[in-house]
Amino acid sequence: QGWQAFKNDATEIIPELGEYPEPPPELENNKTMNRAENGGRPPHHPFETKDVSEYSCRELHFTRYVTDGPCRSAKPVTELVCSGQCGPARLLPNAIGRGKWWRPSGPDFRCIPDRYRAQRVQLLCPGGEAPRARKVRLVASCKCKRLTRFHNQSELKDFGTEAARPQKGRKPRPRARSAKANQAELENAY
């Protein structure tokens, strides 16, 4: 009866088609998903620049079910996973289709969550248990963070650490898409 097939850590991932899936098309809605638009012109001297905004990183879209104990979301949610090495925006594979990976020998930049959004989810539970409603935090956009020698590897693995905690998508930045729009997006996608 239960959801034995699903992990109990809210991380069951359903990869989308393709190696680097495209985000779903934007809906006719004034509340649009934050995207990391921190690309722009690559620096003239990439290793000397202090402007992290000149660097860009990939946002991979994943669709997954949210779980809470034995309960599982009625519908999957789409979220971002921040992926890969940061490099000048023009040299990233998702900026130029045939671009090569740019491997920096200078400062270490990592792709980490920048902002998050909250999305309402309804969780269905086995055994006749009442459904639950929760709000889940999802990564809304990614950013390149310049790591100094004082940052250790554990900070990269654990998004709960200071270097890598997602921030909220605040005005005047682009607003996170509303829960209603996300629901519509998921319904359209499936």
């Epitope: 959004r117 909250a118 639950r132 409603a133 709000k135 889940v136 905690r165 909220k168 996170a176």
Partner: antibody
Framework: EVQLVQSGAEVKKPGASVKVSCKVS????????MHWVRQAPGKGLEWMGG????????IYAQKFQGRVTMTEDTSTDTAYMELSSLRSEDTAVYYC??????????????WGQGTLVTVSS | QAVVTQEPSLTVSPGGTVTLTCGSS?????????PYWFQQKPGQAPRTLIS???DKHSWTPARFSGSLLGGKAALTLSGAQPEDEAEYYC?????????FGGGTKLTVL
């Protein structure tokens, strides 16, 4: 652990404005959803407004719309609540409250100690 | 704006059980109102007991539980202790705008 420290008590005249501050430590302000709640002497709690991470913007209770402004100084991790055109019925303890940084979004988990604002001529 | 209603006062004997309720002027309270319950003692800031209908916090004593009951949100206290004497507030989420109930003064005697 999130900690919130609010500014001290204020005495204001009717028609004036008051700006209450709430300093965040333990996390950065941009990681949190800050809300403001007030409580008149001997009365119940009243939600004034706060940051909505679904829409990415600050929203206000209808009652205070146009009279309250909630701002943040991310360089000092301090949130502010400014209430204008004060009247005697605005005499209350004003609380800031935030969510918890975690997988689930839970509001009002951490509270400031409260700031008493007295409006009197 | 919606009005959220609570019993103004309730009394429970030590060791007894009591249920506080939280209704909405807009109709039935559902899980989509994400009901919160707060406890406040005199001279103190409120503290959250329950979020999202039934979700307890690490500091919430096991004797408190949240649920939906007869179209309202409910907070049940089983095995009341003298220290549970306090004001209890519920809070409902109306699409990102929150409304507190008037509060229930709980007396343990």
């Amino acid at each position: 652990e999130v900690q919130l420290v609010q500014s001290g008590a204020e005495v204001k005249k009717p028609g004036a404005s008051v700006k209450v501050s709430c300093k965040v430590s333990g996390y950065t302000l941009t990681e949190l959803s800050m809300h403001w709640v007030r409580q008149a002497p001997g009365k119940g709690l009243e939600w004034m407004g706060g940051f909505d991470p679904e829409d990415g913007e600050t929203i206000y209770a209808q009652k205070f719309q146009g009279r309250v402004t909630m701002t943040e100084d991310t360089s000092t991790d301090t949130a502010y609540m400014e209430l204008s055109s004060l009247r005697s019925e605005d005499t209350a303890v004003y609380y800031c409250a935030t969510d918890t940084v975690g997988y689930w979004e839970k509001f009002f988990q951490h509270w400031g100690q409260g700031t008493l604002v007295t409006v009197s001529s | 704006q919606a009005v959220v209603t609570q019993e103004p006062s309730l009394t429970v004997s030590p060791g007894g059980t009591v249920t506080l309720t939280c209704g909405s002027s807009t109709g039935t309270v559902t899980i989509d109102h994400y009901p919160y319950w707060f406890q406040q003692k005199p001279g103190q800031a409120p503290r959250t007991l329950i979020s999202d209908t039934d979700d307890k916090h690490s500091w919430t004593p096991a004797r408190f539980s949240g649920s939906l009951l007869g179209g309202k949100a409910a907070l049940t206290l089983s095995g009341a202790q003298p220290e549970d004497e306090a004001e209890y507030y519920c809070l409902l989420d109306y699409g990102g705008r929150f409304v507190f109930g008037g509060g229930t003064k709980l007396t343990v005697l």
